[in-house]
Interface confidence: low
């Protein structure tokens, strides 16, 4: 069937269109094109005779049409009037006619649109804005874009006038955005430049910063005010209702108590005509004087004197605070505070009470500290210490002894030998000693301030022969897997070698055994029951040697898990039940029995004559070592059968 296809169907003004013929019959005489939907000689555009290849323009020919041998018609420089139907009349060789109609539409190329607005400065929550997309164009579709996105759905947004007008009701500051409109028709689409909506808003309630409302006398007051507003707000400050200045910041240097009061910031928007205010109350506190400490006794004597420290000056309705060693006061019966906390009394001072002490006065903003005060506590002398600790010396060596006693003020020292004053020095030196230098060496320490004296006596033996040593222990009854034991070989002697034996053998290598103090001390870590052996120490020098008597270590252990014997668990009725419980333990444990959870006797052996099936149940033996504080237990089930019913054993 003869058909006409318009390519394109929608044509832009000034462009061209081809009316393409499909299914053209064979054996044609010619054809003719007409404007409209029917053959009308008055509206003939062009005719074409195939035999002569002659094209003849008709009344509707515009000079823009070209006919092709295949009957297609090209129309150039399309104008709006060209819109409509076109009919092809085909005359076949047998003079039978055929017709086909096609059509196309002509649309203008759209100009770039622009946006007009009825209100360039709308006020938030009050005004509406109508944007209109210009120009008005027939057969065009209008679209809107906000921030390059399609229009959001909102009851405040309304499209009208064929979508050409976009109205924003009750604008808000959030409507400040980029708006574009777009015009579309079948042949073109054009987008406008952006229009930025400038919404006037505010001022919102201003905020005053910083937020703090308390200041000290002498500080600077610097307040800043801000309110969201378009255009930016104009600011005014009022103090206690009186206008101060028209600035965003209020600065008052070196404030006093008189600057306390209500501070108001007013924000004004000249375009919206609105004012908003915020009030803050500022309190300025007077600066208190720096406190200081007085003492009723600057040189107290340890364990004798009390000291009263007072925080000055006295101020009514003030909180006083105290610190010792940069920490708040410890709880102690020797520390007493007066009712107003202003006086701190130290009862019976000790050398540890030196301080430093600080007091503080608390005001509304902060705490003012005094300078620290240190007490000069007089103490001592303590018992003097004579070093070195050797008591045995060989003839011919030099004897050099030093004495020290804790004391404030420092002690004065004197040396006596066998009760006779030797010298008033802290050190005693005797060269090239002999057996005659053996004796009692006394150091006397004296505190001139307290008048107290203390002495220490040391026995010095000068001999070529070493004495028989002895073993001292720091723990005579250590607990297994818990305690350590340190054996020390006495005495301490100069230029002496110390040796150890265990059960007559030299020391085994063990990570639990450690020698220290020049081998004079043997430490056993985490003792076990196997460490309960005989320990001997020996001393030797170039001229003699000696061994101590043995010391046996008594290790407390257990109780281990007990064993109940005999092992039988099945008995015949009428037999005697004789159970014995044993647990390894040092010292021996205490035993107790429970049958079916019920306490029985506190013995090692449980005896029940002529048992019956009623004696069935659980038999528990409990062991307890009072020395180690440890307990243990074991449970055994006993079954008693009636005579002849079970192959059980009898006791």
């Amino acid at each position: 069937k003869l058909t006409i296809e318009s390519t394109p169907f929608n044509v832009a003004e000034g462009k061209e269109v081809l009316l393409l013929v499909h299914n053209l019959p064979q054996h044609l005489f010619g054809y003719s094109w007409y404007k409209g939907e029917r053959v009308d000689g008055n509206r003939q555009i062009i005719g074409y005779v195939i035999g002569t290849q002659q094209a003849t323009p008709g009344p509707a020919y515009s000079g823009r049409e070209i006919i092709y041998p295949n009957a297609s018609l090209l129309i150039q420089n399309i104008i709006q009037n060209d819109t409509g139907f076109y009919t092809l009349h085909v005359i076949k060789s047998d003079l039978v006619n055929e017709e086909a109609t096609g059509q196309f539409r002509v649309y203008p190329e759209l100009p770039k649109p622009s946006i007009s607005s009825n209100n360039s400065k709308p006020v938030e929550d009050k005004d509406a804005v109508a944007f209109t997309c210009e120009p008005e164009t027939q057969d065009a579709t209008y679209l809107w874009w906000v921030n390059n996105q399609s229009l959001p759905v909102s009851p405040r947004l309304q499209l009208s006038n064929g979508n050409r007008t976009l109205t924003l009701f009750n604008v808000t500051r959030n409507d400040t955005a980029s708006y574009k409109c777009e015009t579309q028709n079948p042949v073109s689409a054009r987008r406008s430049d952006s229009v930025i909506l400038n919404v006037l808003y505010g001022p919102d309630a201003p905020t005053i910063s910083p937020l703090n409302t308390s200041y000290r006398s002498g500080e600077n007051l610097n307040l800043s005010c801000h309110a969201a507003s378009n255009p930016p707000a104009q600011y005014s400050w009022f103090v206690n209702g009186t206008f101060q200045q028209s600035t965003q910041e209020l600065f008052i240097p070196n404030i006093t108590v008189n600057n306390s009061g209500s501070y108001t910031c007013q924000a004004h928007n000249s375009d919206t005509g609105l004012n908003r205010t915020t009030v803050t109350t500022i309190t300025v506190y007077a600066e208190p004087p720096k406190p200081f400490i007085t003492s009723n006794n600057s040189n107290p004597v340890e364990d004798e004197d009390a000291v009263a420290l007072t925080c000055e000056p006295e101020i009514q309705n003030t909180t006083y605070l105290w610190w010792v060693n940069n920490q708040s006061l410890p709880v102690s019966p020797r520390l007493q505070l007066s009712n107003d906390n202003r006086t701190l009394t130290l009862l019976s001072v000790t050398r540890n009470d030196v301080g430093p002490y600080e007091c503080g006065i608390q005001n509304e903003l902060s705490v003012d500290h005094s300078d620290p005060v240190i007490l000069n506590v007089l103490y001592g002398p303590d018992d003097p210490t004579i070093s070195p600790s050797y008591t045995y010396y060989r003839p011919g060596v030099n004897l050099s002894l030093s004495c020290h006693a804790a004391s404030n003020p420092p002690a004065q020292y004197s040396w006596l030998i066998d009760g006779n004053i030797q010298q008033h020095t802290q050190e005693l030196f005797i060269s090239n000693i002999t057996e005659k230098n053996s004796g009692l060496y006394t150091c006397q320490a004296n505190n001139s301030a307290s008048g107290h004296s203390r002495t220490t006596v040391k026995t010095i033996t000068v001999s070529a022969e070493l004495p028989k040593p002895s073993i001292s222990s720091n723990n005579s009854k250590p607990v297994e897997d818990k305690d350590a034991v340190a054996f020390t070989c006495e005495p301490e002697a100069q230029n002496t070698t110390y040796l150890w034996w265990v059960n007559g053998q030299s020391l085994p290598v063990s990570p639990r055994l450690q020698l220290s103090n020049g081998n004079r001390t043997l430490t056993l870590f985490n003792v076990t029951r196997n460490d309960a052996r005989a320990y001997v120490c020996g001393i030797q020098n170039s001229v003699s040697a000696n061994r101590s008597d043995p010391v046996t270590l008594d290790v407390l252990y257990g109780p281990d898990t007990p064993i109940i014997s005999p092992p039988d668990s099945s008995y015949l009725s009428g037999a005697n039940l004789n159970l014995s419980c044993h647990s390894a333990s040092n010292p021996s444990p205490q035993y107790s029995w429970r049958i079916n959870g019920i306490p029985q006797q506190h013995t090692q052996v449980l005896f029940i004559a002529k048992i019956t099936p009623n004696n069935n149940g659980t038999y528990a033996c409990f062991v307890s070592n009072l020395a180690t504080g440890r307990n243990n237990s074991i449970v055994k089930s006993i079954t008693v059968s009636a005579s002849g019913t079970s192959p059980g054993l009898s006791a």
């Epitope: 921030n147 996105q149 399609s150 959030n174």
Partner: antibody, heavy 121, light 107 residues
Framework: EVQLRQSGPELVRPGASMKISCKAS????????MTWVKQSHGKILEWIGL????????VYNQKFKGKATLTVDKSSSTAYMELLSLTSEDSAIYYC??????????????WGQGTLVTVSA | DIQMTQSPASLSASVGETVTITCGAS??????LNWYQRKQGKSPQVLIY???NLADGTSSRFSGSGSGRQYSLKINSLHPDDVATYYC?????????FGGGTKLEIK
């Protein structure tokens, strides 16, 4: 009552393409944008893109350009998402969601029940 | 793209307790943030839009707050029915990115 009814679960071969439908009822179809969201790995949600039924305009997440094609049929109030050249990475639940807005904040007020897509040989 | 970071990834709380979920954006999103709840096997539903506004049908036990880059969702007086995964979402600019989700369980 607003409803978004999605097409049923799909099992598709790798390399194939498929189309999910989302039929809207109970509101004016052209009044809201239609958004598509992918839920994978149990909980991760990814925004694929949106289409404005009023004029057919689309906005895609760059990650899904070439993977998803969004279309609408206004006459049947139905939105479609075509997924192209599927791989196992595309196995997920896909939701359509109708947008609402206040000022310039959009949110997804109405959601379809989800369509499970499994890509497997 | 704007990145949304949610924390914690999961949390467990007792009935009656108050819980808070936070969400950070990689840039200022000016309050353009929504919160969604997704229960097991169900579609997500909006709880809060525009950072602070309660969506229709959302219980008043839920509240949203925040501005700039930091936002939070607070659930008062926890109910067993609140067990779900919660998501925040940027809606300032496309792509409308979601947070990684917070799975809420009842102790």
């Amino acid at each position: 009552e607003v409803q978004l009814r999605q097409s049923g679960p799909e099992l598709v071969r790798p390399g194939a393409s498929m189309k999910i439908s989302c039929k809207a009822s109970g509101y004016s179809f052209t009044a809201y944008t239609m958004t598509w969201v992918k839920q994978s790995h149990g909980k991760i949600l990814e925004w694929i893109g949106l289409i404005a039924p009023y004029h057919g305009g689309t906005v895609y997440n760059q990650k899904f350009k070439g993977k998803a094609t969004l279309t609408v049929d206004k006459s049947s109030s139905t939105a479609y998402m075509e997924l192209l050249s599927l791989t196992s990475e595309d196995s997920a639940i896909y939701y359509c969601a109708g947008g609402a807005s206040s000022g310039f904040v959009t949110w997804f007020a109405y959601w379809g029940q989800g369509t499970l897509v499994t890509v497997s040989a | 793209d704007i990145q949304m970071t949610q924390s914690p990834a999961s949390l467990s709380a007792s009935v009656g307790e108050t819980v808070t979920i936070t969400c950070g954006a990689s840039e200022n999103i000016y309050g353009a943030l929504n919160w969604y709840q997704r229960k097991q096997g169900k579609s997500p539903q909006v709880l809060i839009y525009g950072a602070t506004n309660l969506a229709d049908g959302t219980s008043s036990r839920f509240s949203g707050s925040g501005s700039g880059r930091q936002y939070s969702l607070k659930i008062n007086s926890l109910h067993p029915d609140d067990v779900a995964t919660y998501y925040c979402q940027n809606v300032l600019s496309t792509p409308y990115t979601f947070g990684g989700g917070t799975k809420l369980e009842i102790k």
